[in-house]
């Protein structure tokens, strides 16, 4: 439950267009115990690759690239009646505004695949 | 290339820790034709729960959890020779800071959840 | 090579206990966490417990907490399950397996997942 329960809600109409933000990142448990390999391990394997932009925060985005169309099967050999597809994201970034070295931003939601999945061709049914 | 070159990236030591920023979001149409299907398509299939908090900017954020410990077969059965994980993504988000009703976020790292993968065991070479 | 052998399962009535061991070969505890998990005929396979050596952290499911408490003995490569209070629903296939992640907040299927290895399995029926 809010802390502030009269507050508005930043995504309610009448909340301020601006507001300020501390750039000091409070790190929530973000547990980075687990298991980086996954994209090798998968069934559907992925490549990482960096996406940078110095008007952009945060500047550096890892995005994730299926290696096959098909799925990797149990000899390592890639099955085609399954289709390797990138699982993806929205995202909020913040934006520099284009003023020459303004401390404004603004957020800006961005499409990310984060990493590939297997799944099972559908087949839509054509009249 | 970076509209302003000179300029302090926004991740370096000595750029300003407070920033104005517009919550007018940039790029609303992120492409949402992406098929959302994925979840019970995979093979390593996942339920999607609502995590909701009004604190923070965005409010409502979709986690995937796994349906499975192993990954599910061309029958349809589960294959507990193969691992069902959870691929995640830290991601940014705003977080009021906890003076009443201020207009003041700070920004937090968050993991999450965005869908599942299917991999195969990895047995670490013990010593 | 890893391997895990689990013993103990036997049939007992509703209402008493059981201990189940898991002696673990080719690993030690400092190199994997731990899972109990069960399968009842025709279900799915389910966490039951993790255990973590590294900080003697334990995780139940709710359909057990308060009843099943997981321990180890470091020195026999063993961990344990003790099962009180048994229900016939508690009726399944019992495996304990080395997994490779154990977080609480994880969104897999069960705390502990990512399994390297699992056992054999031994089996525990609850007669009413």
């Known amino acids: 439950s809010p802390q502030n329960p009269g507050c508005p809600n930043a995504e309610d109409k009448n909340f301020p267009r601006t507001v300020m933000v501390n750039l000091n990142i409070r790190n929530r448990n973000t547990n980075s115990k687990r298991a980086s390999d996954y994209y090798n391990r998968s069934s559907s394997p992925w490549n990482l690759h960096r996406n940078e932009d110095p008007e952009r925060y945060p500047s550096v985005i890892w995005e994730a690239k299926c290696r096959h169309l098909g799925c990797v099967d149990a000899d390592g050999n890639v099955d085609y009646h399954m289709n390797s597809v990138p699982i993806q994201q929205e995202i909020l970034v913040l934006r520099r505004e284009p003023r020459h070295c303004t401390n404004s931003f603004r957020l800006e939601k961005m499409l990310v695949s984060v990493g590939c999945t297997c799944v099972t061709p559908i087949v839509r049914h054509v009249a | 290339s970076p509209q302003n070159p000179g300029c302090p990236n926004a991740e370096d030591k000595n750029f300003p820790r407070t920033v104005m920023v517009n919550l007018n979001i940039r790029n609303r149409n992120t492409n949402s034709k992406r098929a959302s299907d994925y979840y019970n398509r995979s093979s390593s299939p996942w339920n999607l729960h609502r995590n909701e908090d009004p604190e923070r900017y965005p409010s409502v954020i979709w986690e995937a959890k796994c349906r499975h410990l192993g990954c599910v077969d061309a029958d349809g059965n589960v294959d507990y020779h193969m691992n069902s994980v959870p691929i995640q993504q830290e991601i940014l988000v705003l977080r009021r800071e906890p003076r009443h009703c201020t207009n003041s976020f700070r920004l937090e790292k968050m993991l999450v959840s965005v869908g599942c993968t299917c991999v195969t065991p990895i047995v670490r070479h013990v010593a | 090579e890893v391997q895990l052998v689990e013993s103990g399962g036997g049939l007992v009535q509703a209402g008493g206990s059981l201990r189940l061991s898991c002696a673990a070969s080719g690993f030690t505890f400092d190199d994997y966490d731990i899972g109990w998990f069960r399968q009842a005929p025709g279900k799915e396979r389910e966490g039951v417990s993790c255990f973590t050596s590294s900080d003697g952290r334990t995780f139940y499911a709710d359909s057990v907490k308060g009843r099943f408490t997981v321990s180890a003995d470091n020195a026999k490569n063993t961990v344990y399950l003790q099962m009180n209070s048994l229900e016939p629903e508690d009726t399944a296939v019992y495996f304990c397996?080395?997994?490779?992640?154990?977080?609480?907040?994880?969104?897999?299927?069960?705390?502990?997942?990512?399994?390297?290895?699992w056992g054999q399995g031994t089996q525990v029926t609850v007669s009413s």
């Open positions: 397996a080395a997994v490779n992640t154990f977080d609480e907040s994880a969104y897999a299927a069960f705390a502990c997942y990512d399994v390297v290895r």
